[in-house]
Amino acid sequence: MAVTACQGLGFVVSLIGIAGIIAATCMDQWSTQDLYNNPVTAVFNYQGLWRSCVRESSGFTECRGYFTLLGLPAMLQAVRALMIVGIVLGAIGLLVSIFALKCIRIGSMEDSAKANMTLTSGIMFIVSGLCAIAGVSVFANMLVTNFWMSTANMYTGMGGMVQTVQTRYTFGAALFVGWVAGGLTLIGGVMMCIACRGLAPEETNYKAVSYHASGHSVAYKPGGFKASTGFGSNTKNKKIYDGGARTEDEVQSYPSKHDYV
């Protein structure tokens, strides 16, 4: 029961995490204009992995896609790649873990196969979460570096009279969504790996023991107590616990993306 709960919870946590990773990847607020030096700006800039946006005094928001691949910074490309790899691995992990769930019966799939699949999906979730955390962290580091660089030469004199403030960017909401989502996916993956161990306990071999009774020479060879590890076939004396085939409809809710007006 505890194993089923751990596996189910791991699946749900990972599902939420991957939904969050997808949401973060699609969000436009990876970096937002730092308002510390210009709190009264009527033009608010923010940027995502795929496009940059400007919200004007009218409330109108205009977004422009990055219609170039070669012209983009290598770091941005790397972040994109990490997030996409994280999503792909997470999606495959979800697919595998659905079939691995103990509460769902598919044909005559053995516990050994389910344990294997649980471990596989768990590893995929862990790698997916790490990819997301790495991607977000690389972007955050890039922001911090650029922030201090732009602070160093923030005011560029124009004819010695007029000062123009260079736009600085700080952490956007997507970074926090990405970190939390990556963490959840990672935790979900760890839970799946723990559940796998529960599905596949250590193999125990009971050696035959001879009992010598007076007047009789009888040898008892207890059989059918070889514990299934989930990795070897154990067709004899295998008890199938079937609590009834349950189909649990998972409600999947992806955070929606908003242009804040």
Epitope: Q33, A42, V43, S57, S58, G59, E62, R64, V162, V261
Partner: antibody, heavy 115, light 113 residues
Framework: QVQLVQSGAEVKKPGASVKVSCKAS????????IHWVKQAPGQGLEWMGY????????NYNLKFKDRVTLTSDTSISTAYMELSRLRSDDTAVYFC????????WGQGTLVTVSS | DIVMTQSPDSLAVSLGERATINCKSS????????????LIWYQQKPGQPPKLLIY???TRDSGVPDRFSGSGSGTDFTLTISSLQAEDVAVYYC?????????FGGGTKLEIK
Amino acid sequence: QVQLVQSGAEVKKPGASVKVSCKASGFTFTSYNIHWVKQAPGQGLEWMGYISPGNGGSNYNLKFKDRVTLTSDTSISTAYMELSRLRSDDTAVYFCATGRGFAYWGQGTLVTVSS
Amino acid sequence: DIVMTQSPDSLAVSLGERATINCKSSQSLFNSGNQKNYLIWYQQKPGQPPKLLIYRASTRDSGVPDRFSGSGSGTDFTLTISSLQAEDVAVYYCQNDYSYPLTFGGGTKLEIK
């Protein structure tokens, strides 16, 4: 087509309050900010502030902040500008404006403050 | 606050001639996020609300005749009417659309010589 229709002219005594309405039509009311602009007789334009009907957010010109209240009612697509503690120099035409680059303006509401 | 200074205060130009109105801001209106200048030009005729001509310093609003053009960047901007028509007689205002409070120039009264 986009239209902003303002309430009629008002005559008020000093110290009183006035509430001017601006009814919007032809666009999604919650998508754009509604700005208010003052124009005293024979004078230039002066921005008073804006209300964002989508989230209720607002921004005021500090010159008017303590006396102006901007509100909106999304159910009837109407924005309001209330000016309190009226003085004689508040006599002016008040416009509401919206759209990109203030593309759309109300016809203006003349508020006369006279004792 | 950003101060908008328009020049001249009034201008008389012959029909068919070019009219040029200048606007200077005390701070740059250039937004590095999208490489645009946030300056607006309006035309106002007596008893009417202002009419949008140009936004983002050089983008003509829909329905505005192409004889109206805006140029400039940073702190110096210009509105040009290439060939003055009788219906262009009005007061023209520039506006800072970059920083709150949004501020307007004092206006330039355009008349026919």
